[in-house]
């Protein structure tokens, strides 16, 4: 399936007071990632 976003890197965003980077979660919760779930494991982040 086409995957517009390459999910190898994580962490575009950071909001003070939040426990995680927004972009980390955004990538994990993107349409592109949802299409890949169950087909390949999450690649490790560097």
């Amino acid at each position: 399936l086409a995957d517009p976003l390459d999910h190898r890197d994580a962490g575009d965003l950071w909001f003070p007071g939040e426990s995680e980077s927004f972009e980390d979660a955004h990538v994990e919760h993107s349409i592109s990632r949802s299409l890949l779930e169950g087909e390949i494991p999450f690649p490790p982040t560097s």
Partner: antibody
Framework: EVQLVETGGSLVQPGKSLKLTCATS????????MHWVRQSPEKQLEWIAH??????????YYAESVKGRFTISRDDSKTTIYLQMNSLKEADTAIYYC?????WGQGVMVTVSS | DTVLTQAPLSVSVTPGESASISCRSN???????????LYWYLQKPGKSPQLLIY???NLASGVPDRFSGSGSETDFTLKISEVETEDVGVYYC?????????FGPGTKLELK
């Protein structure tokens, strides 16, 4: 095939309300964070609202221009997101897109005019 | 707010030649882990925006490699190495680093 289909646009008078619907298909919906972005007649794109997933307590975020007037929501069982728009202003006239920022719907026109 | 400005606002290119579009941010778009949150979209006439470049320099799936993105923390460039007819439309930069998310005003690309 990923599909995002917006409906509910129309011509409304200032001060009135309107509810937009974005029906999605072709991908597992419940874990996806969704957004509404609008495009003014001058073609400027403006992000207006964002809703997270159930695991994030359906947290929502809004642009100042719509905060207190617009409400984004979702129904995971129907794989659908909504945008309830109240106290509409002429400045809200735009094409409204639902998007995951990677995939976009075709858009729906909302015209606010007396 | 994070304000994005683009230049030029309109560009006319001969097919086969290269084109460059600039996007400047009033704030750094460098996030944690050295990820730069600058995205490029193309909106073809009568269509919805489509993702071209994410995180400043990464090509989205299905996008021809004649498109490339580069830049620093506040200054960014989209380059099209050999413009084709299908590249006509309005190019927008966007940032997803800070709320509210913002888009540039767009650059209209036309063919000579």
């Amino acid at each position: 095939e990923v599909q995002l289909v917006e409906t509910g646009g129309s011509l409304v008078q200032p001060g009135k309300s309107l509810k937009l619907t974005c029906a999605t298909s072709g991908f597992p919906f419940s874990n996806v964070w969704m957004h509404w972005v609008r495009q003014s007649p001058e073609k400027q794109l403006e992000w207006i609202a964002h809703i997270k997933a159930k695991s994030d307590n359906y947290a929502t975020y809004y642009a100042e221009s719509v905060k207190g007037r617009f409400t984004i929501s979702r129904d995971d069982s129907k794989t659908t997101i909504y945008l309830q728009m109240n106290s509409l202003k002429e400045a809200d006239t735009a094409i409204y897109y639902c998007t995951g920022l990677d995939y976009w719907g075709q858009g729906v026109m909302v015209t606010v005019s007396s | 707010d994070t304000v994005l400005t683009q230049a030029p606002l309109s560009v006319s290119v001969t097919p086969g030649e290269s084109a460059s579009i600039s996007c400047r941010s009033n704030k750094s778009l460098l996030g944690i882990r050295d990820i730069t949150s600058l995205y490029w979209y193309l909106q073809k006439p009568g269509k919805s925006p489509q993702l071209l470049i994410y995180r400043m320099s990464n090509l989205a799936s299905g996008v021809p490699d004649r498109f490339s993105g580069s830049g620093s923390e506040t200054d960014f460039t989209l380059k099209i190495s050999e413009v084709e007819t299908e590249d006509v439309g309005v190019y927008y930069c966007a940032q997803f680093l800070r709320y509210p998310y913002t888009f540039g005003p767009g650059t209209k690309l036309e063919l000579k």
